[in-house]
């Protein structure tokens, strides 16, 4: 059981992917802090030459959904929906392999950006993965 809140997305950095859908936040005023963090991360990514087009096409929406997870509307308590593990692994191991290696070895990026750990996500086909967020 989670101890958080479901509230409409109020930011702009991820509005293209999230719109004004309801997102899960651990505290009522956390959205502003996360919005600032993701803007800082996007600023670093945008000015870096380490991001390929094929990676950014999927990494940006994926980071948005990770930072601002949709609320699970099938749950009776506020609960975030996970990213889909298979897509997370494709992103990390295929589409953005070079970028992930660079990011994980760069303290400046790690300070500003929480990267999803695919191993923490439920296995495909498991009941917990049934409602995962597909990019």
């Amino acid at each position: 059981e989670e101890d958080g809140f479901c509230q409409p997305y109020r930011g702009i950095a991820c509005a293209r992917f999230i719109g004004n859908r309801t997102v899960y936040m651990e505290s009522l005023h956390m959205q502003g802090e996360i919005e600032n963090q993701i803007t800082a991360a996007f600023t670093m990514i945008g000015t870096s030459s380490h991001l390929s087009d094929k990676c950014s096409q999927f990494a940006i929406p994926s980071l948005c959904h990770y930072a601002f997870p949709y609320c699970d509307e099938t749950s009776s308590v506020p609960k975030p929906r996970d990213l889909c593990r298979d897509e997370c692994e494709i992103l990390e191991n295929v589409l953005c392999q070079t970028e992930y290696i660079f990011a994980r070895s760069n303290p400046m990026i790690l300070m500003r950006l929480k990267l999803p750990n695919c191993e923490d996500l439920p296995q495909p086909e498991s009941p917990e993965a049934a409602n995962c967020i597909r990019i």
């Epitope: 109020r10 930011g11 702009i12 950095a13 991820c14 509005a15 293209r16 992917f17 004004n20 009522l28 005023h29 502003g32 919005e35 600032n36 803007t39 996007f42 600023t43 945008g46 000015t47 940006i60 948005c64």
Partner: antibody
């Protein structure tokens, strides 16, 4: 030096269209939120729309939703406001401004461009 | 939409006076409030962001504070160049809304 320069204002008939431009220089354009804010003659400030060029995300005021479209060309460091189905109440000075995040203030503003909707 | 109710709409003051302008949000906006100064025919200028942070280059006589949904802009000692219109703005929710403005005039 950070600069925002608006252009494209003028006189247009009700129901007509106009495209405003906001040319940015002196900063990493795609990393900032660009806003359009308007001010009717003798009135207060009204926020109109915003775009985050890096993710092409946009948000609008209800009063312009469906009529106005905000866009950005990162290769030209320019934001645009396409205004269709213009009404007399859209008459205002239109400013573009930037903010590093929507949760922070608009720290640089352009000089404004006047849009007059009248027959 | 979140309403930002600014008061007073105008005030007369003398150089050296302490001036206080208030903005009340119709619901919680956290600390996502900025204050701007605008002079006739000019673009607004940012004074305060995040309710109480002084923007770079703004004189220290300007300050901002928050108490719940009430936000205050204070000018500790009014200077001749401070006669202008002041606006608050919330950026917590869409649409981003401004207060109606407070015109500070010379007494």
């Amino acid at each position: 030096e950070v600069q925002l320069v608006e252009s494209g204002g003028g006189l247009v008939q009700p129901g007509g269209s106009l495209r405003l431009s906001c040319a940015a220089s002196g900063f990493t354009f795609q990393s900032y939120v660009i806003h359009w804010v308007r001010q009717a003659p003798g009135k207060g400030l009204e926020w109109v729309a915003a775009i985050y060029p890096y993710s092409s995300s946009t948000i609008y005021a209800d009063s312009v939703k469906g009529r106005f479209t905000i866009s950005a060309d990162t290769s030209k460091n320019t934001a645009y406001l396409q205004m269709n189905s213009l009404r007399a109440e859209d008459t205002a000075v239109y400013y573009c401004a930037r903010s590093w995040s929507v949760y922070l203030g608009m720290d640089y503003w352009g000089q404004g461009t006047l849009v007059t909707v009248s027959s | 939409d979140i309403q930002m109710t600014q008061s007073p709409s105008s005030l007369s003051a003398s150089v050296g006076d302490r001036v206080t302008i208030t903005c009340r949000a119709s619901q919680s906006v956290s600390s996502a409030v900025a204050w701007y100064q605008q002079k006739p025919g000019k673009a607004p200028k940012l004074l305060i962001y995040s309710a109480s942070s002084l923007y770079s280059g703004v004189p220290s006589r300007f300050s901002g504070s928050r108490s719940g949904t009430d936000f205050t802009l204070t000018i500790s000692s009014l200077q001749p160049e401070d006669f202008a219109t002041y606006y608050c703005q919330q950026s917590y929710d869409s649409p981003r809304t401004f207060g109606q403005g407070t015109k500070v005039e010379i007494k």
